[in-house]
Interface confidence: medium
């Protein structure tokens, strides 16, 4: 049997929401059993249609209608064959879409005007992905690489910390971090070392 | 001219059995599906499951999964809906669908181009 | 379970413009299907892939699909249109279909 899959290039390139239709012809068999295969397993859902063009040609399609980054990955058709298995040449579908946050900023609990860092990193594709930072509604730094390491010198107030993820798809906005004032018992030596620095807030270092 | 062709049912007691046959005529039985479909009287579609144009894979919906069973009979071109057991909230009419197409876009079971004209299968003790 | 939802009856004057929605979690992966059902007949598609019509339907049906909300629309409904309309689509994983419970449309 001829087996290849039709209509989508060895590599196929699709936007995150998009539909997707995979075509996969099989020539030299009467009822072939054609079967979707995604990274080694077969894809068992109702998504498939099979035309019969001709009695001895076929065409199966695997239909997505909105892609999102789960649905990436190498697709093939296969047909069994007189007991034996036969694959078609396999297509990688790449979806991309806007950043997507595998670290977010986390709340944390800091001394007055002890120096705290942030985390913040995001993937696509598409690459490159580059961050811009915001403290409240004021950006502090960026855009720089992901990931990113945001290295505050210290607050004396509860302060909310963001950071945005751009690549050529659009932006991505992470959850917002508080980070809060702890509280320093009195007489300690943090407190009386650091009572008198009401606007430490020194302009953060924005490195990767 | 595709054809659907319903068996008809009689009345039946709760805990009979029960099999219920779609005769296909007009195109190539194995080229399609066929999905079975319940309607209860006054009540609105219920999708029961489906049979793969081949007979090698079936689904079923959730409340169906363990109460019927589909089959079909490739040299009879006729899909089948059995119960071992019936129950009177099975009353209902039946109806068999032959799935997908050779027109562009549709997707298996979705696309339902042709409906039996169903079965009424009455369950009274 | 996964399940679609539709409002019972909705009622337009003729050359009106009827709207019935299906609502259901899965709609943003999965297509929406319009099935209409004559009094004592047997169901036929209206609507394929959320905005595709069948083959031989009226212009004035038309679907579309937003978020998870799926609508028929029948511009300019007619008498003939008087019927019940039920949405269909596939659950979450693929591996069963769901028929909403069904909207009767009159057109008074």
């Known amino acids: 049997a001829g087996l290849k899959l039709m209509g989508a290039p060895v590599k196929l390139t699709v936007s995150q929401g998009q539909p997707v239709k995979l075509n996969c012809s099989v020539e030299g068999m009467e009822e072939p059993d054609i079967q979707w295969v995604k990274d080694g397993a077969v894809v068992q859902n109702l998504d498939q249609l099979y035309i019969p063009v001709s009695e001895q040609h076929w065409i199966g399609f695997l239909s997505l209608k909105s892609v999102e980054r789960s649905d990436a990955g190498r697709y093939w058709c296969q047909v069994e064959d007189g007991g034996e298995t036969e694959i078609s040449q396999p297509v990688w579908l790449t979806v991309e879409g806007v950043p997507f946050f595998t670290v977010e900023p986390k709340d944390l609990a800091v001394p007055p005007n002890a120096p705290f860092q942030l985390s913040c990193e995001a993937v696509g594709p598409p690459e490159p992905v580059t961050i811009v930072w915001w403290r409240g509604t004021t950006k502090i730094g960026g855009p720089a690489p992901s990931p990113s390491v945001l290295n505050v010198t210290g607050v004396t107030q509860s302060t909310m910390f963001s950071c945005e993820a751009h690549n050529l798809k659009g932006l991505a906005s992470s959850r917002t971090a508080t980070v809060h004032l702890q509280l320093v018992p009195r007489g300690s030596s943090a407190h009386h070392h650091h009572h008198h620095h009401h606007s430490a807030w020194s302009h953060p270092q924005f490195e990767k | 001219e595709v054809q659907l062709v319903q068996s008809g049912a009689d009345v039946k007691k709760p805990g009979a059995s029960l099999t219920i046959s779609c005769q296909a005529s007009?195109?190539?039985?194995?080229?399609?599906?066929i999905s079975w479909v319940r309607q209860k009287p006054g009540k609105g579609l219920e999708w029961m499951g489906a049979?793969?144009?081949?007979?090698?894979?079936?689904y079923y919906g959730p409340s169906f999964q363990g109460h019927v069973t589909i089959s079909a009979d490739r040299s009879t071109a006729t899909a089948y809906l059995q119960w071992r057991s019936l129950e009177a909230s099975d009353t209902a009419m039946y109806y068999c669908?032959?799935?997908?197409?050779?027109?562009?876009?549709?997707?298996?079971?979705?696309?339902?181009?042709?409906w039996g004209p169903g079965t009424l299968v009455p369950v009274s003790s | 379970s996964y399940e679609l939802t539709q409002p019972p009856s909705v009622s337009v004057s003729p050359g009106q413009t009827a709207r019935i929605t299906c609502s259901g979690d899965?709609?943003?992966?999965?297509?929406a299907y319009w099935y209409q059902q004559k009094s004592g007949q047997a169901p036929v598609l209206v609507i394929y892939?959320?905005?595709k019509r069948v083959s031989g339907i009226p212009e004035r049906f038309s679907g579309s699909s937003s978020g998870t909300m799926a609508t028929l629309t029948i511009s300019g409904a007619q008498v003939e249109d008087e019927a019940d309309y039920y949405c269909?689509?596939?659950?979450?994983?693929?591996?069963?279909?769901?028929f909403g419970g069904g909207t009767k449309l009159t057109v008074l």
């Open positions: 899965a709609l943003p992966k999965k297509y």
């Open positions: 669908v032959r799935s997908g197409g050779l027109t562009s876009g549709g997707t298996i079971p979705e696309y339902y181009q042709h």
């Open positions: 892939e959320d905005k």
């Open positions: 007009g195109y190539t039985f194995t080229d399609y599906w």
């Open positions: 269909y689509s596939l659950a979450v994983d693929g591996n069963y279909g769901v």
């Open positions: 049979i793969s144009r081949n007979g090698s894979t079936t």
